[in-house]
């Protein structure tokens, strides 16, 4: 007698973070076989879906048309196989983008730096906001908060050719909803090729500043099962 | 083996409550949905709902939504089904079931609640 | 909701027959369906689930088929512990159904 399923996956389409008016698809990835998939927000039901045929059918999506704050928060789901339940997916975290205003991202001293220099963004909003989010583009997209009342500085330390790579900076206005995005500061490490050669794929920051949040582009979805299981897991908690 | 031990017969006026419980032996409580059915005298079988004991999730039949309450009390492996309002149209054998992968597979031997002024 | 429909209510076999019991969802439940066993002053017992396949320590005179809205609860030849009402239940949506039942009584 089979006592548990394995959770399934949950990752939002094209992406976690979604402007306000835009559509978002979530979707869960359990078994074949499944009877129904239901989607949870926030702790509660949110919506039910029955694939038909079951036997054929291993994922189903969930169609947000009109992103807002109302729906930006939590999701999980779950699935059945006759009576028995699944355990609850990860959780996803769904965010609302482009609300109020836009902050101004610079880099100190430059976007161009050598290896070892010491790097800090400073991400700025003048209206009321106390919560700033620096991001790293790519897939593997890292995720900084800064507090300050008009503006917060994010210190990279001293850089490596890791660095490398396009920022763009966020107001949060509460953990799911972010203001429009910053224009992107393009930063350029140089470094001797020794040192590049040996640099890590992504930099090592401080465990209590940084989490690791996979971009769910659809390439890697398709490749990769593990990136599913971490779409934009524990973001901001 | 698998047990679900059901409380003993309760006899009702109309308006009051009920609270029938289940103790569930020979498995892992929270691994598994419990489900309640009820049966009228000489009548069918009538699903009421189920509760997950691990999240407490519950789902009703829309029929039994507004007095049902389903909980389920994870350290002492025993699922509850309270019934308030009781008229005598509820006067039935109430079955506590096991939901697994096959269906309902084990069930309660039922508890009588009869409803009578 | 989905309601079953389950036919006949009631009849009258001898021990030897093959006995028949058909079941009709209102709409497709893709073989999510359940067949139980009855006898008076008993709870329910699983016979089959997911329209075909027999639970643990039934009898192989048991047999469930069926697709889409039409199923069948089969007795190959009927034993005397078998004279009993038959259920049969859907678990496709909310709420789950049964049928009206069937009786199975001695000719």
């Known amino acids: 007698q089979q006592q548990t399923l394995p959770k399934p996956f949950i990752w939002a389409e094209p992406h976690f973070m979604v402007p306000k008016e835009k559509q978002v698809t979530i979707c869960c990835q359990g078994n074949y076989g499944a009877v129904e998939y239901q989607l949870h927000f926030e702790g509660s039901l949110f919506a039910v879906d029955r694939p038909k045929p079951p036997e054929r059918i291993n994922k189903v999506k969930f169609y947000i048309p009109d992103m807002n704050s109302r729906m930006a928060g939590q999701y999980s789901c779950i699935y059945r196989v006759g009576e028995l339940w699944s355990e609850p997916s990860n959780l996803l975290d769904l965010v609302v983008t482009e609300m109020y205003d836009t902050p101004t991202l610079s880099v100190h001293p430059g976007p161009e730096v050598i290896s070892g220099e010491k790097v800090t963004f400073y991400c700025r909003l003048d209206t009321a906001t106390s919560m700033f989010l620096l991001l790293k583009e790519g897939r593997s997209s890292h995720v900084q908060r800064g507090y300050g009342k008009v503006q917060a500085e994010f210190p990279l330390g001293p850089v490596t050719t890791a660095h490398r790579g396009t920022y763009r900076c966020f107001g949060s206005y509460n953990n799911h909803a972010w203001s429009f995005p910053s224009e992107p500061v393009k930063l350029l490490v140089t470094g001797d090729i020794e040192n590049t050669s040996l640099a890590p794929e992504d930099p090592t920051f401080p465990a209590d500043t940084w989490g690791t949040y996979l971009l769910t582009t659809e390439t890697g979805l398709q490749k990769d099962h593990a990136l599913w299981d971490h779409t934009a897991q524990n973001l901001l908690r | 083996q698998v047990q679900l031990v059901q409380s003993g017969a309760e006899v009702k006026k109309p308006g009051a409550s009920v609270k029938v419980s289940c103790k569930a032996s020979?498995?892992?409580?929270?691994?598994?949905?419990m489900h309640w059915v009820r049966q009228a005298p000489g009548q069918g079988l009538e699903w009421i709902g189920y509760?997950?004991?691990?999240?407490?999730?519950?789902e009703y039949n829309q029929k039994f939504k507004d007095r049902t309450t389903l909980t389920a009390d994870k350290s002492t492996s025993t699922a509850y089904m309270e019934l308030s309002s009781l008229r005598s149209e509820d006067t039935a054998v109430y079955y506590c079931?096991?939901?697994?992968?096959?269906?309902?597979?084990?069930w309660g031997q039922g508890t009588l609640v009869t409803v009578s002024s | 909701d989905i309601q079953m429909t389950q036919s006949p209510s009631s009849l009258s076999a001898s021990v030897g027959d093959r006995v028949t019991i058909t079941c009709r969802a209102s709409e497709n439940i893709y073989s999510n369906l359940a067949w139980f066993q009855q006898k008076p002053g008993k709870a329910p017992k699983l016979l089959v689930y997911a329209a075909t396949n027999l639970a643990d320590g039934v009898p192989s005179r048991f047999s469930g088929s069926g697709s889409g809205t039409d199923y069948t609860l089969t007795i190959s030849s009927l034993q005397p512990e078998d004279f009993a009402t038959y259920y049969c239940q859907h678990f496709w949506g909310t709420p789950r159904t049964f049928g009206g039942g069937t009786k199975v009584e001695i000719k």
């Open positions: 020979g498995y892992t409580f929270t691994s598994f949905t």
């Open positions: 509760i997950n004991p691990s999240s407490g999730y519950t």
């Open positions: 079931v096991r939901g697994s992968s096959r269906g309902f597979d084990y």
